[in-house]
Interface confidence: low
């Protein structure tokens, strides 16, 4: 029974809930190009960190079966059919795999090798290759290679008349919602409808804030446990029900969205999951839901 678990076990189990490993699924058809998104936000333009892509889940260190590697400034290793199609200098290290076959199915590791002990960001992305559909009439492919990066760039105020959404200044949760409304009828929305792509918004937040929220969640859970125990109304409270509390503000956002991995704290948000041609949604979802592919992200300073 949950109420009789030692306090240390409760904390440990809560911590495990907060640090679930992420594995998101992506699909492509044989013969198409597969697109596996991976991003980070350089501390300053050009201040890049090494990144490796490997076939297989992320090991403790480095990448296994490396297919592409960057250093602080350069792509220093790549193999045929694997390349970076995006704006590498601005932190878009998304991997494109050309002309995929069934053998390309599996887990891929994107490892962002942030300086410091055990600071690496690790992303496991599951690629599922489906046999090519045989259709008599030509249909527009859902080519993520083409579709996804289009969301990244708007004409704007960059040094060469280009602005990347990933570098918009001072964006916050309220502005994300506003942005969603402003873009609903825009050309970008039309692109989204055409491509079926999604935009991932990842917001980097100070570790202190996250720690505070995590503590608040733990305190809330303990108070809830105490309340339940004292009222003797709930004899069995499982971790499953704890993890699936209905959406109720920040506590749920922390439970569902914060991933504490090594020393990096991230809230992942999913904006514009395109369900139907003219329906656009802006909502928070946990990165652990494999049915919802991740797209691009904004970064808070």
């Amino acid at each position: 029974m949950f109420s009789h678990l030692p306090f240390d076990c409760v904390l440990l189990l809560l911590l495990l809930l907060l640090t679930r490993s992420s594995e998101v699924e992506y699909r492509a058809e044989v013969g198409q190009n597969a697109y596996l998104p991976c991003f980070y936000t350089p501390a300053a333009p050009g201040n890049l960190v090494p990144v490796c892509w490997g076939k297989g889940a992320c090991p403790v260190f480095e990448c296994g079966n490396v297919v592409l590697r960057t250093d602080e400034r350069d792509v220093n290793y790549w193999t045929s059919r694997y390349w970076l199609n995006g704006d590498f200098r601005k932190g878009d290290v998304s991997l494109t795999i050309e002309n995929v076959t069934l053998a390309d199915s599996g887990i891929y590791c994107c490892r962002i090798q942030i300086p410091g002990i055990m600071n690496d960001e690790k992303f496991n992305l599951k690629l599922v290759i489906k046999p090519a559909k045989v259709t008599p009439a030509p249909t527009r492919q859902r080519d993520f290679t083409a579709a996804f990066p289009r969301m990244l760039t708007t004409r704007g105020h960059g040094p060469a008349e280009t602005q990347t959404l990933g570098s918009l200044p001072d964006i916050n949760l309220t502005q994300i919602s506003t942005l969603a409304n402003e873009l609903r009828d825009s050309r970008l929305a039309n692109d989204l409808r055409d491509s079926g792509a999604t935009i991932r918004i990842g917001i980097y937040i100070g570790a202190g804030i996250c720690a505070g929220l995590a503590l608040a969640l733990i305190f809330g859970a303990l108070i809830f446990k105490w309340y339940s125990h004292s009222k003797e109304k709930i004899q069995n409270l499982s971790l499953i029900s704890l993890a699936n509390l209905p959406p109720s503000g920040l506590a749920n956002a922390v439970a569902e969205g914060i991933r504490s991995e090594e020393n990096i704290y991230t809230i992942e948000e999913n904006v514009y999951e395109v369900e139907e041609p003219n329906e656009y949604y802006c909502y928070v979802s946990s990165r652990q839901q494999p049915s919802q592919p991740l797209g691009c992200r904004f970064a808070m300073p």
């Epitope: 201040n47 602080e72 400034r73 790549w78 970076l84 990244l152």
Partner: antibody
Framework: EVKLLESGGGLVQPGGSLKLSCAAS????????MSWVRQAPGKGLEWIGE????????NYTPSLKDKFIISRDNAKNTLFLQMSKVRSEDTALYYC???????????????WGQGTSVTVSS | DIVLTQSPASLAVSLGQRATISCRAS??????????MHWYQQKPGQPPKLLIY???NLESGIPARFSGSGSRTDFTLTINPVEADDVATYYC?????????FGGGTKLEIK
């Protein structure tokens, strides 16, 4: 063998428009950033702009942004430069160029076409 | 924009001697210790040809007589020894920041 062949140059009147093409062969065009560079007679090189593999990012030198449009057709392995509102100072040899790595736009340009000449005169 | 200033504008060197061309950037073209400065050679009637990339890396097929050095804002192209075939105009170019920019060029002649 990598080949870049520019075409579409010629004589154009001030204020007029012209569309230059660059036909690429010998490499997977759809994987490369591509650039346009121009050179006025007896002058140095001037970078016009670049386009990424799927046309989602196009960077221009600011002074030319309102006059020139860079585009590409990966199915036809062709890069384009649409020139408008041309003036005499746009008279130049126009080169298309390709960087040395196919996934990253910050590299030096290791392949160049022979250029196509544009003369703006009334 | 990053302005690249090449000097000298023209240079006459005897065969077998050393030629040194300088390129100064108005701001650093370095990031994480790597310099995004490149050198090109252009002969009359021909397109530019890449000689050196990222300050000091010799492009494939280019003779070892050509070398590059420098970091941040000051860069040098050295040709040693100069041969008759080296008569051309040499340009530096930075790709650290859009818009990419070229230097004004240095014309190398033989004494």
């Amino acid at each position: 063998e990598v080949k870049l062949l520019e075409s579409g140059g010629g004589l154009v009147q001030p204020g007029g428009s012209l569309k230059l093409s660059c036909a690429a062969s010998g490499f997977d065009f759809s994987r490369y950033w591509m650039s346009w560079v121009r050179q006025a007679p007896g002058k140095g090189l001037e970078w016009i702009g670049e386009i990424n593999p799927d046309s989602s990012t196009i960077n221009y030198t600011p002074s030319l942004k309102d006059k020139f449009i860079i585009s590409r057709d990966n199915a036809k392995n062709t890069l384009f430069l649409q020139m408008s509102k041309v003036r005499s100072e746009d008279t130049a040899l126009y080169y298309c160029a390709r960087p040395s790595y196919d996934g990253y736009y910050g590299y030096a340009m290791d392949y160049w076409g022979q250029g196509t000449s544009v003369t703006v005169s009334s | 924009d990053i302005v690249l200033t090449q000097s000298p504008a023209s240079l006459a060197v005897s065969l077998g001697q050393r030629a040194t061309i300088s390129c100064r950037a108005s701001e650093s073209v370095d990031s994480y210790g790597k310099s995004f400065m490149h050198w090109y050679q252009q002969k009359p009637g021909q397109p530019p040809k890449l000689l050196i990339y990222r300050a000091s890396n010799l492009e494939s097929g280019i003779p070892a007589r050509f070398s590059g050095s420098g970091s941040r804002t000051d860069f040098t192209l050295t040709i040693n020894p100069v041969e008759a075939d080296d008569v051309a105009t040499y340009y530096c170019q930075q790709s650290n920041e859009d818009p990419y920019t070229f230097g004004g060029g240095t014309k190398l002649e033989i004494k």
